[in-house]
Interface confidence: low
């Protein structure tokens, strides 16, 4: 395919990736389709400055990241490793919490209030963020 | 402290183009997180969003100005810049710039503010 | 025509609290956060309120910011006659995909 250069209309560029911020909410695996019909994924943390910067974008608000343990470990979906990789959850998170009766446990991981990630219902509505990485090949098939 | 200060003529001939530049001190405008905005306001009316830019060049436009409006970074002079092409009497306003603070629902957060230029578009 | 609309003025007595009404949709004000704006004769705006309620440093306590629904409000309790001047509301507008601003409230202060 060929290489994005630019990030597509309203999304912002930051470091080499483009982000686009949701302002509804979607369960996680809507959200995760969502980004993946745009050549894109659920946003992938690789440190803190990227951290500072998606949660100065989202604010005080629960945002799902692409980051879940619906088939037992935990992983990004970028295939980026998850036991070496940057992590920022709140105290005691996860937890894999089953008392809040919606059946099963909590295998999605989002950004809370503060910031910090906590593991949660797949089913929530939670806002989202999508992310592209610039000069990766995109899947439209190449112009003959 | 961050202060904005605009500059660019006063007058436009109709049909030209409007070109502005704000200079930014105090801050720098390749700060991660905010956006630099261009606003408008038509005299005696109210206020205008023309568009904005972030550091690393993305631009978001209102889109009644569109296919007119250009928002371009000088990173090395610390400054930003308005083009507005095919301008008429109806584009004579106060031209602002701001910054936005750009973050969660946030994009009107514009603090501080230039003190703004008066367009006239006449011949 | 503006998309958030404001009453074209609104006057009160020195000490007297002054409310301001700005009024809009779900895809600005019902979706987003307001921010407000004072614009003193012949300057530029200036940030009052934003995020709602939230008041930026240097901005007296008299000022205070509420949002309910489609609908947002900013009050001037114990006027002042230097707070006479136009006021405006914004927010963000998922339909434009961009900042929207109220026509503005002229306060006189009698």
């Known amino acids: 395919g060929s290489e994005r250069t630019c990030c597509p209309v309203n999304w912002v560029e930051h470091e080499r990736s483009c982000y686009w911020f949701s302002r509804s909410g979607k369960a996680w695996a809507d959200a995760d389709n969502y980004c993946r019909l745009e050549d894109a994924h659920l946003v992938v943390v690789t440190s803190w400055e990227e951290q500072k910067f998606v949660q100065h974008h989202i604010g005080p608000v629960n945002t799902w990241m692409g980051l879940h343990d619906q088939n037992g470990p935990w992983k990004w979906v970028d295939g980026t490793d998850y036991e070496t990789g940057f992590k920022n959850w709140r105290p005691e998170q996860p937890d894999d919490w089953y008392g809040h009766g919606l059946g099963g446990g909590e295998d999605c991981a989002h950004f809370t209030d503060d910031g910090r990630w906590n593991d949660d219902v797949c089913q929530r509505p939670y806002r989202w963020v999508c992310e592209t990485e610039l000069d990766k090949a995109s899947q439209e098939p190449p112009l003959l | 402290q961050v202060q904005l200060q605009e500059s660019g003529p006063g007058l436009v001939n109709p049909s030209q183009t409007l070109s502005l530049t704000c200079g930014v001190s105090?801050?720098?405008?390749?700060?991660?997180?905010?956006?630099w905005s261009w606003i408008r306001q038509h005299p005696g009316k109210g206020l205008e969003w023309i568009g904005y830019?972030?550091?690393?060049?993305?631009?978001y436009y209102n889109p009644s100005l569109k296919s007119r409006v250009s928002i371009s970074l000088d990173t090395p002079k610390n400054q930003f810049s308005l083009k507005l092409t095919s301008v008429t009497a109806a584009d004579t306003a106060v031209y602002y710039c701001?910054?936005?603070?750009?973050?969660?629902?946030?994009?009107?957060?514009?603090?501080?503010w230039g003190q703004g230029t008066l367009v006239t578009v006449s011949s | 025509q503006s998309v958030l609309t404001q009453p074209p003025s609104a006057s009160g007595t020195p000490g007297q609290r002054v409310t301001i009404s700005c009024s809009g949709s779900?895809?600005?004000?019902?979706?987003?956060?307001v921010s407000w704006y004072q614009q003193l004769p012949g300057t530029a705006p200036k940030l009052l309120i934003y995020?709602?309620?939230h008041r930026p440093s240097g901005v007296p306590d008299r000022f205070s910011g509420s949002k309910s629904g489609t609908s947002a409000s900013l009050a001037i309790s114990g006027l002042q006659s230097e707070d006479e001047a136009d006021y405006y509301c914004?927010?963000?507008?998922?339909?434009?995909?961009?900042?929207?601003f109220g026509g503005g409230t002229k306060l006189t202060v009698l």
């Open positions: 914004a927010a963000w507008d998922d339909s434009l995909k961009g900042p929207v």
């Open positions: 701001a910054r936005d603070w750009g973050g969660y629902d946030s994009s009107g957060w514009f603090d501080p």
């Open positions: 830019i972030y550091y690393s060049g993305s631009t």
């Open positions: 995020s709602n309620d």
């Open positions: 779900s895809s600005n004000i019902g979706n987003n956060a």
């Open positions: 105090g801050g720098s405008i390749s700060s991660g997180y905010y956006y």
